[in-house]
């Protein structure tokens, strides 16, 4: 199975010298960037990438290892430090405060300084720290956010919202008395805390009364709207944009992203987290890929540039049922969507970044030989006299004992999407793992992206490479041709 | 198959104390749920207690039940209803049940009588 | 908030049409979170109607809610024999004290 050039020296050594060469070449560019673009792969730790990319691979009829994801392609990359001010290991909203803020902050908290505390309401108001969409927006460009979760979920909601809990999605799970103290949920800020000019994603629910049928499932009362303030949250955001739409099926988000009249979008395309990509109808919702390419159309009208944060945020729901297929399909449709992207945009003026806010306990091992199933088995037998696979998990909801012995697999078995990757501990949701992750950077000012970070560091390189706030004395030459 | 069952009921005296416990299955409170208690005196229409939500552990009761019943989150999968201070006219069928509006899911009940 | 349902009982020939009305204190949250519960002895409620009009799961089309912030209807034409049972309103209004309430019940009795 192993190709017969690599068995020649020269096939790799011819390699590296193009790569060399490549590397030579490498010019920082000392030019602001116009337009900035985040790519956060939700949970994508390095054993992802490396996993994804066998799939991909693999999904191409190759032997997996020497694809190229798109991210590969990026020139610069460094190593971000995730850990939350309170926590080795930490969750989604502390990272988004501080890849999207440039301040760390505590467990579950978003948008705020660690002087927050989780779930107190009144530790909030003082504390609040300011994104870079936020400040791209004040310097006049137009902002979006686009993600497979809930548009009010952790990663996107550091984008927008200060908020103690990051599970106060709408005002019905906010506390009464978090309520009378002034804290607001996060659909309630999505709306009212800045104009955005681009939203898409799922959390339809949170944006409607309870009682409002789900325009998708309106016989399911379980999907319908949540909110007990009465308030019909995209029916004052339309009311504030005269050139506002909203959409909530993919039908609908083609025509309205071709439509020059449309000057705000927002597309809500299921009532919650939006489908895996395997289980997505795709006549009704869009894909990452698509929905990236809708905002892109959009936000590139604007002669100031854009920021867009993109998100695969479902990378993480598969890891924490570890389900790893979902997990790496997932992974793969972002890599897409940030193929889709790179075409659409020019190197010249748009600063793109791939990062993850956090990894995974999933690893990828047992000596498996080349070209076999990333889902398969590693060869021969485990000490139990068993079969394992190579993607297994340290803990999560895939440990079973049958007769208090750990189950045999088969290949059958561990090849569906349903299957759920054995690991050490039970636990009802895999978690998080705490080591660094890695940040890929292309474009204007993405020299800066280098060595060991901290994840603070990511919104900062944006900053300046924008000359936004507090790198407006940037000293940056505007990219020839720029208009103001 | 979702299910809701309560247990703990049983004679009591009046001016006692009793806890009624309500098991979940094939589902658990890490999702948000609103989690009500209801009763029906024998022969009687149904009368709302209160509830709680899951997700932020917020309670709400009906006046008359207000400082004598108290409904907790106790696991992911348990709901407790505290009673005090019981008196012959809270003898009744206690149903532990799913959702606010509407109500989704419903316990058999569990049977309460207060008695000397 | 208050919910006062009536009649309080009604016999119905097989194949009739019966109506139950149910009238909220003051208006519903959304206008229309009402639900209403069909309980037939030893047994628990059984949801037929949400949103005030919207059928619950499995539940026959001779089921028909209508009605909005105060006013209710609950109308079950063709009536069968097994629709003998009682039937509750319950209305929300907020998550507050009283913010739920049951109407009185309806027995329905099939002749």
């Known amino acids: 199975i192993i190709p017969v050039e690599e068995e020649n020296p020269d096939f790799w050594n011819r390699q590296a010298a193009e790569a060399l060469g490549a590397a030579k070449k490498l010019q920082p560019a000392q030019t602001a960037a116009k337009n900035l673009i985040i790519f956060l792969g939700d949970g994508m730790g390095v054993s992802t990438v490396t996993a994804a990319r066998i799939l991909k691979g693999q999904k191409k009829d190759k032997l997996g290892p020497e694809t190229f994801l798109a991210m590969d392609r990026f020139p610069y990359v460094a190593l971000s430090k995730t850990y939350s001010v309170d926590k080795h290991v930490p969750d989604s909203g502390a990272t988004a405060t501080a890849y999207l803020c440039g301040v760390k902050g505590n467990f579950q908290t978003i948008g705020l300084s660690a002087a927050a505390r989780f779930n107190q309401c009144n530790t909030t108001r003082g504390n609040e720290v300011i994104s870079v969409m936020n400040r791209a927006k004040k310097a006049g460009k137009s902002v979006g956010v686009v993600t497979t979760t809930r548009v009010q979920h952790a990663s996107p909601a550091g984008a927008y919202a200060h908020t103690v809990n990051r599970n106060w999605y709408s005002d019905a799970d906010v506390p009464a008395s978090a309520r009378q103290e002034g804290c607001q949920d996060i659909a309630t800020q999505l709306i009212s805390n800045m104009d955005i000019d681009v939203i898409l994603g799922g959390g339809r629910k949170y944006m409607f009364p309870m009682g409002t049928p789900d325009p998708e499932y309106p016989d399911d009362y379980s999907q319908g709207g949540t909110r007990l303030d009465g308030k019909n949250l995209v029916q004052e955001w339309l009311a504030k944009h005269q050139g506002a739409r909203y959409v909530w099926n993919r039908t609908e988000l083609l025509q309205a992203s071709l439509d020059p009249s449309v000057t705000h979008l927002m597309g809500l395309f299921e009532p919650g987290d939006m489908k895996y990509e395997i289980h997505r109808d795709s006549t009704l919702d869009p894909s990452l890929m698509e929905m990236t390419e809708a905002a892109l159309l959009l936000l590139s009208r604007n002669p100031r540039g854009f920021f867009l944060f993109v998100e695969g945020g479902r990378i993480d729901h598969g890891h924490h049922e570890s389900r790893a297929y979902r997990a790496l399909t997932e992974t793969i449709m972002f890599d897409d969507a940030i193929e889709r992207a790179g075409q659409l945009t020019s190197e010249e003026d748009t600063l793109s970044l791939v990062t993850a806010d956090h990894s995974h306990v999933f690893s990828f091992g047992g000596y498996p030989l080349r070209g076999s199933s990333i889902f398969g088995l590693a060869p021969g037998k485990a000490r139990d006299r068993k079969a394992y696979t190579v993607l297994l998990y340290g803990n999560g909801p895939g440990y079973v004992l049958k007769d208090g012995a750990r189950p045999d697999v088969t290949e059958s078995e561990s090849g569906s999407p349903e299957y759920r990757q054995q690991s050490a501990v039970p636990l009802d949701g895999e978690t998080h793992a705490g080591e660094d992750v890695a940040v890929f950077a292309r474009g204007p000012q993405a020299h800066l992206v280098h060595g060991v970070q901290e994840q603070t560091f990511i919104a900062h390189v944006m900053a300046f490479a924008a000359c936004l706030e507090p790198y407006t004395a940037c000293d940056l030459a505007p990219r020839a041709g720029t208009t103001d | 198959q979702e299910r809701l069952e309560e247990s703990g009921g049983g004679l009591v005296q009046p001016e006692g104390s009793l806890t009624l416990t309500c098991t979940a299955s094939?589902?658990?409170?890490?999702?948000?749920?609103?989690m009500c208690w209801v009763r029906q005196a024998p022969g009687k229409g149904m009368e709302w207690i209160g509830c709680?939500?899951?997700?932020?552990?917020?309670t709400w009761y009906a006046s008359w039940a207000k400082g004598r019943f108290t409904v907790s989150k106790t696991s992911s999968t348990t709901v407790t209803l505290q009673m005090t201070s019981l008196t012959a006219t809270d003898t009744a069928t206690y149903f532990c049940?799913?959702?606010?509006?509407?109500?989704?899911?419903w316990g058999p009940g569990t049977l309460v009588t207060v008695s000397s | 908030i208050v919910m006062t349902q009536t009649p309080s009982s009604k016999s119905v020939p097989v194949g009739d049409t019966v109506t139950i009305n149910c009238q909220a204190s003051?208006?519903?949250?959304?206008?229309?979170?009402l639900g209403w519960y069909q309980q037939k002895p030893g047994q628990p409620p059984k949801l037929l109607i949400y949103w005030a009009s919207t059928l619950a799961s499995g539940v026959p089309s001779r089921f028909k809610g209508s009605g909005s912030g105060t006013q209710f209807t609950l109308t079950i034409s063709d009536v069968e024999c097994d629709d003998a049972a009682t039937y509750y309103c319950a209305g929300y209004k907020s998550r507050t004290t009283d913010g739920s309430a049951f109407g009185g019940g309806t027995e329905v009795v099939v002749k």
């Open positions: 094939g589902f658990s409170f890490s999702s948000s749920y609103y």
């Open positions: 003051e208006s519903i949250y959304n206008n229309n979170n």
């Open positions: 049940a799913r959702g606010l509006s509407p109500i989704d899911l």
């Open positions: 709680i939500y899951t997700g932020n552990d917020d």
